[in-house]
């Protein structure tokens, strides 16, 4: 058993049929010695008396809020949560496996630049009685500070018969140099509590590996005189690290005909313009990627040819 | 510790081309190592990230763009003195700070070159003949060092009398390649910045 926060404790259980469970001793936080009784949750049934209560925790029915009283007055609470271990593996029932970039990916994180700011998100099908708490650091043995905000519900989607909820959190490394060469990864730890079930999820990454620039901005077409051609130009996104001559991007330019069957033409360029033959109903799209360290491509910025 | 904006002679900054080739070569070599050594811990997640130049050179700090010198977190107090007669800019206007930056890059390359050559000598003795260093990568390191044109005493190749442990050597190769790729990215960024200045 260990303390998650004040008056909230996590009991770690090996979860299998007829498991013996864990013996837990609860102590009432009071100077009083006599006349103390214990109850669980909303029930008025007295579970025991005395300053301490010994219980055998085997299943969710044994978890919950234990309260010690004296003469109708509440003295203190202890909330017991369960953390299940099945076949040596901690349960992951609360969050959905996103399977990207690999199986058992519950947390996904992205950064728009090298400032040390990043966003993580996760998915669940649970809609109520759910709380998250997020901690992060650079490295684990001698951790350096990363500050995370509160996790918030950022999207709701319908997937078949189920509703899916996306939560996200923003974190910022306390003292980040955009030009630094990372040797210790960022660690992100999410505590998830659903009713009386506790689970924790972790992710470890270098900022350089989770970079995904915003799409290029100001994608524009300028017709060229006496020609079917247009000059396509775009700019670095505002959120990208500066100076741009140091933090350079490379771009993918794609021309797609009206029908999806038509063959796409695409090129890669370090420049911020190209010349395109603009056919009716075609569209021109541009996306960006760090020029020197190939992490994710941005989403496409698109403009119709008409 | 920063790069003042300098005005190189017209035309392509001579080292940019070489640094692009360096990054391409080390990325290809790392990819080859990951594929060939698939049953060894050779991915970014599996290896320990070590920097053989730590406390010996200070490329990131010495080559910091002017715009980042206002960022307290970027200003490390490490001081290292370097030879300052680089000719990469092909211009007498090469500032002291820029020479410091370029000589730091040169020292990095020299250190990695020695490590890679020593390692290759060991790998050539492996009866499995599983992996060797790409000669193109070694040649590209050499070309960039020549373009940087610093006079520096040659470091003798490390030789070892004990029987090489090929498993450890291959893991060390992965560690070195990962670290060298990260440094090659920094070098490319620096050269691109200097080219635009």
């Amino acid at each position: 058993i260990w303390e998650l926060k004040k008056d909230v404790y996590v009991v770690e259980l090996d979860w299998y049929p007829d498991a013996p469970g864990e013996m837990v001793v609860l102590t009432c936080d009071t100077p009083e010695e006599d006349g103390i009784t214990w109850t669980l949750d909303q029930s008025s049934e007295v579970l025991g008396s005395g300053k301490t209560l010994t219980i055998q925790v085997k299943e969710f029915g044994d978890a919950g809020q234990y309260t010690c009283h004296k003469g109708g007055e509440v003295l203190s609470h202890s909330l017991l949560l369960l953390h299940k271990k099945e076949d040596g593996i901690w349960s992951t029932d609360i969050l959905k496996d996103q399977k990207e970039p690999k199986n058992k990916t519950f947390l996904r994180c992205e950064a728009k630049n090298y400032s040390g700011r990043f966003t993580c998100w996760w998915l669940t099908t649970i809609s109520t009685d759910l709380t998250f708490s997020v901690k992060s650091s650079r490295g684990s043995s001698d951790p350096q500070g990363v500050t995370c905000g509160a996790a918030t519900l950022s999207a709701e989607r319908v997937r078949g018969d189920n509703k899916e909820y996306e939560y996200s959190v923003e974190c910022q490394e306390d003292s980040a140099c955009p030009a630094a060469e990372e040797s210790l990864p960022i660690e992100v730890m999410v505590d998830a509590v659903h009713k009386l079930k506790y689970e924790n999820y972790t992710s470890s990454f270098f900022i350089r590996d989770i970079i995904k620039p915003d799409p290029p901005k100001n994608l524009q077409l300028k017709p060229l005189k006496n020609s079917r051609q247009v000059e396509v130009s775009w700019e670095y996104p505002d959120t990208w690290s500066t100076p741009h001559s140091y933090f350079s991007l490379t771009f993918c330019v794609q021309v797609q005909g009206k029908s999806k069957r038509e063959k796409k033409d695409r090129v890669f360029t370090d420049k911020t313009s190209a010349t395109v033959i603009c056919r009716k109903n075609a569209s021109i799209s541009v996306r960006a990627q760090d020029r020197y360290y190939s992490s994710s491509w941005s989403e496409w910025a698109s403009v119709p040819c008409s | 510790r920063n790069l003042p904006v300098a005005t190189p002679d017209p035309g392509m900054f001579p080292c940019l081309h070489h640094s692009q080739n360096l990054l391409r070569a080390v990325s290809n070599m790392l990819q080859k190592a990951r594929q060939t050594l698939e049953f060894y811990p050779c991915t970014s997640e599996e290896i320990d990230h070590e920097d053989i130049t730590k406390d010996k050179t200070s490329t990131v700090e010495a080559c910091l763009p002017l715009e980042l010198t206002k960022n307290e977190s970027c200003l490390n107090s490490r001081e290292t003195s370097f030879i300052t007669n680089g000719s990469c800019l092909a211009s007498r206007k090469t500032s002291f700070m820029m020479a410091l930056c370029l000589s730091s890059i040169y020292e990095d390359l020299k250190m990695y070159q020695v490590e890679f050559k020593t390692m290759n000598a060991k790998l050539l003795m492996d009866p499995k003949r599983q992996i060797f260093l790409d000669q193109n990568m070694l040649a590209v390191i050499d070309e960039l060092m020549q373009a940087l044109n610093f006079n520096s005493e040659t470091v003798p190749q490390k030789s070892s009398l004990e029987e090489p442990d090929f498993y450890k050597t291959k893991i060390k190769l992965c560690i070195l390649l990962h670290a060298f790729r990260i440094r090659a990215v920094t070098i490319d960024r620096v050269m691109s910045y200097l080219n635009a200045s």
């Epitope: 330019v253 021309v255 033409d265 695409r266 090129v267 890669f268 360029t269 190209a274 010349t275 033959i277 | -």
Partner: nanobody, 124 residues
Framework: EVQLVESGGGLVQAGGSLRLSCASS????????MGWFRQAPGKERESVAT????????DYADYVKGRFTISRDNAKNTVYLQMDSLKPEDTAVYYC???????WGRGPDEYDTWGQGTQVTVSS
């Protein structure tokens, strides 16, 4: 693998025009980005113009923009460079090059297949 042969070079007066052709042998011509490069005596090889696989996307070096036009005919396995308003500084050996997915703007190292070159001389 493609093989490339340039033609159409020659001597021309300043202000005149030339049309260079680059013929490719190989059935996979339309899988390649094509580029024209040039090299003047004592200088580095530099990019002139590049064209995408279907010919829809093109790019030009600033020093030839508005004067040169790159095009291709995939049925004939040929790429062209129409050079108008020629200047003495355009004098160089012009090379045709091919690559499957080069990064434009990064210079000759992105291209793996080259022609032998054709001389263009512009007299004043």
């Amino acid at each position: 693998e493609v093989q490339l042969v340039e033609s159409g070079g020659g001597l021309v007066q300043a202000g005149g025009s030339l049309r260079l052709s680059c013929a490719s042998s190989g059935r996979t011509f339309s899988n390649y980005n094509m580029g024209w490069f040039r090299q003047a005596p004592g200088k580095e090889r530099e990019s002139v113009a590049t064209i995408s696989r279907s010919g829809v996307i093109t790019d030009y070096a600033d020093y030839v923009k508005g004067r040169f036009t790159i095009s291709r005919d995939n049925a004939k396995n040929t790429v062209y460079l129409q050079m108008d308003s020629l200047k003495p500084e355009d004098t160089a050996v012009y090379y045709c090059a091919a690559a499957r997915s080069p990064v434009w703007g990064r210079g000759p190292d992105e291209y793996d297949t080259w022609g032998q070159g054709t001389q263009v001389t512009v007299s004043s």
